[in-house]
């Protein structure tokens, strides 16, 4: 019985898209066949969910439709990316781990990745 | 105001039911997994039970299991606690508890207190 | 099943003074402890979590510290409010367990 560590990258630049990419890495204590994993976001010590989804081992990684997450899992990893985003969605975004099933329950926090996103200039207007 | 308010305690029997419940307000309660925790007179606190938000997966102490069922109604933002066989070492304040994102019981009821005596 | 150890179970302090309460596990829980403070007859309230991260609203008098096995909750200056039962808890795995408690109470 030990506690589960994960590891996710310091920091992450948006593409100009508004789209972001990082992998979630986690140490499993337990043979899980069940997991949990949720985006964070942390911003004046407030934390919002931004989206989350349960996989079972060996399987794809689903977020509901309407999520602004998708990811794909492979062993201890999920890699995932968030769309959408704005200039003033930049902030720290924390991996959050659950082995749900079977139990025991372990839970799993990463330090957070700060994902800078910076808005497009508009395309400047032309003569021709 | 994020609240939560216990009811159902009282006086019961060895061996006698007794159902609580917790009732959720100020919150969206169906995001977030609920624990009940108890605590004996003068003593420590002790967790029971907790439930995921959607109902999925539920954790028992050793000391319950078997004995308590915990359940949830999203719809109508309460968690209860069914007690069965009831033992005269259940006698306790039990809180319901809201787990927080990262983890810890972050919101608690003001507790209700159950008496398993003959 | 980890077992949390509070040490000692009473500590007496004058309004004012610094008081540091220890918190050791039998086996690592990373950074997954939290600490309440508990009055007679009231509810326990969530001061710190993930070892050192004060909750919404606390003051910033109280602070943790620690990570593995080993850990710590100062208080730096006791208000008089602040006379209370103190628990330490982990939530890094089920069953979740809390320590016995150390009551702060007035010299």
């Known amino acids: 019985c030990k506690a589960m560590h994960v590891a996710q990258p310091a920091v992450v630049l948006a593409s100009s898209r508004g789209i972001a990419s990082f992998v979630c890495e986690y140490a499993s204590p337990g043979k899980a066949t069940e997991v949990r994993v949720t985006v964070l976001r942390q911003a004046d010590s407030q934390v919002t969910e931004v989206c989350a989804a349960t996989y079972m081992m060996g399987n794809e990684l689903t977020f509901l439709d309407d999520s602004i997450c998708t990811g794909t899992s492979s062993g201890n990893q999920v890699n995932l990316t968030i769309q959408g985003l704005r200039a003033m969605d930049t902030g720290l975004y924390i991996c959050k781990v659950e082995l749900m099933y079977p139990p025991p329950y372990y839970l799993g926090i990463g330090n957070g990745t700060q994902i800078y996103v910076i808005d497009p200039e508009p395309c400047p207007d032309s003569d021709f | 105001e994020v609240q939560l308010l216990e009811s159902g305690g009282g006086l019961v029997q060895p061996g006698g039911s007794l159902r609580l419940s917790c009732a959720a307000s100020?919150?969206?309660?169906?995001?977030?997994?609920m624990s009940w925790v108890r605590q004996a007179p003068g003593k420590g606190l002790v967790w029971v039970s907790s439930?995921?938000?959607?109902?999925?997966?539920?954790y028992y102490a050793d000391s319950v299991k078997g004995r308590f069922t915990i359940s949830r109604d999203n719809a109508k933002n309460s968690l209860y606690l069914q007690m069965n066989s009831l033992r005269a070492e259940d006698t306790a304040v039990y809180y319901c508890?809201?787990?927080?994102?990262?983890?810890?019981?972050?919101?608690w009821g003001q507790g209700t207190m159950v008496t398993v005596s003959s | 099943e980890i077992v949390l150890t509070q040490s000692p179970a009473t500590l007496s302090f004058s309004p004012g003074e610094r008081a540091t309460l220890s918190c050791r596990a039998s086996?690592?829980?990373?950074?997954?402890l939290a600490w309440y403070q508990q009055k007679p007859g009231q509810a326990p309230r969530l001061l710190i979590y993930?070892?050192?991260s004060r909750a919404t609203g606390i003051p910033d008098r109280f602070s943790g510290s620690g990570s593995g096995t080993d850990f710590t909750f100062t208080i730096s200056r006791l208000e008089p409010e602040d006379f209370a039962v103190y628990y330490c808890q982990q939530y890094g795995s089920s069953p979740f367990t809390f320590g016995p408690g150390t009551k702060v109470d007035i010299k």
């Open positions: 508890a809201r787990v927080g994102l990262m983890g810890p019981f972050d919101i």
């Open positions: 439930i995921s938000s959607s109902s999925s997966y539920i």
């Open positions: 993930g070892a050192s």
């Open positions: 086996q690592s829980v990373s950074s997954y």
């Open positions: 100020g919150f969206t309660f169906s995001s977030y997994a």
